[in-house]
């Protein structure tokens, strides 16, 4: 029972984690304009892995995709790759773990096969979580480096008279979503690996012992004990996917005669 619970919980935690990794990868707020100690601008900049956005005080938001591949920083490409690898591994892991769940019976699948699948999915979740954490951490490090570089030249005087304000970026919501999601996926993977140990058949081989009874001879050969694959009481197929409802910032939108976003 404890094994089923551990496996089921590991699956659910990993599912939420992978949903979070997908959400973080798609989010536009990986880096947001630093408003602290900055001149008050009526424009708010934020950037994601795939596009950069600008929200005006009017509420009009304009997003532009990074339509170049070669022109992008290598670090950004690396972060993209890590997140995609994390999602792919996580998705495969989820698929494998569904079939590995103790509460789901598929034909006459052996417990040893389920144990192997559970271990495989667990490892996949661990690697997926590590990829996400690594990706987010690389991006965060990149932000910190750029932040202090831009702070050093916050006001670059042009001829001593005109000042150009450099936009500084700080951690966006997607980084925190990514860290938490990566952590959840990692925890889920560890739980799956722990569950795998409980699922593995414990082969306790005893030597055959002959009991001589009067009249006729009967030999008892106790074999290995196999764990029963009984169904759990909870057979409901619950959907645990968290859609991640986002609340829009309370800003003025601009329903102009020329709306184009």
């Amino acid at each position: 029972m404890a094994v089923t619970a551990c496996q089921g919980l590991g699956f659910v935690v990993s599912l939420i984690g992978i949903a979070g990794i997908i959400a973080a990868t798609c989010m536009d707020q990986w880096s947001t304009q630093d408003l602290y100690n900055n001149p008050v601008t009526a424009v708010f900049n934020y950037q994601g892995l795939w596009r950069s956005c600008v929200r005006e005080s009017s509420g009009f938001t304009e997003c532009r995709g990074y339509f170049t591949l070669l022109g992008l920083p290598a670090m950004l490409q690396a972060v993209r790759a890590l997140m995609i690898v994390g999602i792919v591994l996580g998705a495969i892991g989820l698929l494998v773990s569904i079939f590995a769940l103790k509460c789901i019976r598929i034909g006459s699948m052996e417990d040893s096969a389920k144990a192997n699948m559970t271990l495989t999915s667990g490892i996949m979740f661990i690697v997926s979580g590590l990829c996400a954490i690594a990706g987010v951490s690389v991006f965060a490090n990149m932000l910190v480096t750029n932040f202090w570089m831009s702070t050093a030249n916050m006001y670059t005087g042009m001829g001593g008279m005109v000042q150009t304000v450099q936009t500084r970026y700080t951690f966006g919501a997607a980084l925190f979503v990514g860290w938490v999601a990566g952590g959840l996926t990692l925890i889920g993977g560890v739980m799956m690996c722990i569950a795998c140990r409980g699922l593995a058949p414990e082969e306790t081989n005893y030597k055959a012992v002959s009991y001589h009874a009067s009249g006729h001879s009967v030999a008892y050969k106790p074999g290995g004990f196999k764990a029963s694959t009984g169904f759990g009481s909870n057979t409901k197929n619950k959907k645990i996917y968290d859609g991640g409802a986002r609340t829009e910032d309370e800003v003025q939108s601009y329903p102009s005669k020329h709306d184009y976003v």
């Epitope: 601008t41 009526a42 005080s57 003025q252 020329h258």
Partner: antibody
Framework: QIQLVQSGSELKKPGASVKVSCKAS????????MNWVRQAPGQGLEWMGW????????TYADGFTGRFVFSSDTSARTAYLQISSLKAEDTAVYFC???????????WGQGTLVTVSS | DIVMTQSPDSLAVTTGERATINCKSS????????????LTWYQQKPGQPPKLLIY???TRESGVPDRFSGSGSGTDFTLTISSLQAEDVAVYYC?????????FGQGTKLEIK
Amino acid sequence: QIQLVQSGSELKKPGASVKVSCKASGYTFTNYGMNWVRQAPGQGLEWMGWINTYTGESTYADGFTGRFVFSSDTSARTAYLQISSLKAEDTAVYFCATLGYGNSLAYWGQGTLVTVSS
Amino acid sequence: DIVMTQSPDSLAVTTGERATINCKSSQSLLNSGNQRNYLTWYQQKPGQPPKLLIYWASTRESGVPDRFSGSGSGTDFTLTISSLQAEDVAVYYCQNNYFYPFTFGQGTKLEIK
């Protein structure tokens, strides 16, 4: 079409208060931020600040804090500018204007002349 | 606060000729996020409220004749009327829409020579 209709001219004594209204039509009122601009006789335009009609949050320019208050009534689709402790130098035409693309002032009211004289 | 300086203060141009008004800001109005300049041009005729002509330094508002054009980037901007018409006589203002407060230039009075 979008229209902003302001209240009529006001003649006030120094120290009194005045409330200028700006009624909007032709759009969803809470979708547009409302700006207030002052123009003293024969002078240029002076941006006073704006109110986010969705949240009610106001941003004031330097020199327009304290005596000047922006407010809005969503149900009446109206924005208000209240000036207290009026001074002679407050004599001006006050315009309301909506925020547009590029944070520009896209649509303007016809203006309200406030005259402060003893 | 951002200081917006317009030049000249007044300008007299013959009908059909080109009119050019300049506007200089004390800080760059270019937003690196979208590479747009947050500068707006308005036209104000006597006894009327100002009218929006150009936003984002060069984007013409719908309904504005194409003889009006805006250019410039960073701190230096220009409003050009390619062929001056009698109805273009007005005061023209530039405005910073990047930093609070949204300061206006002092205005340029355009007349017909």
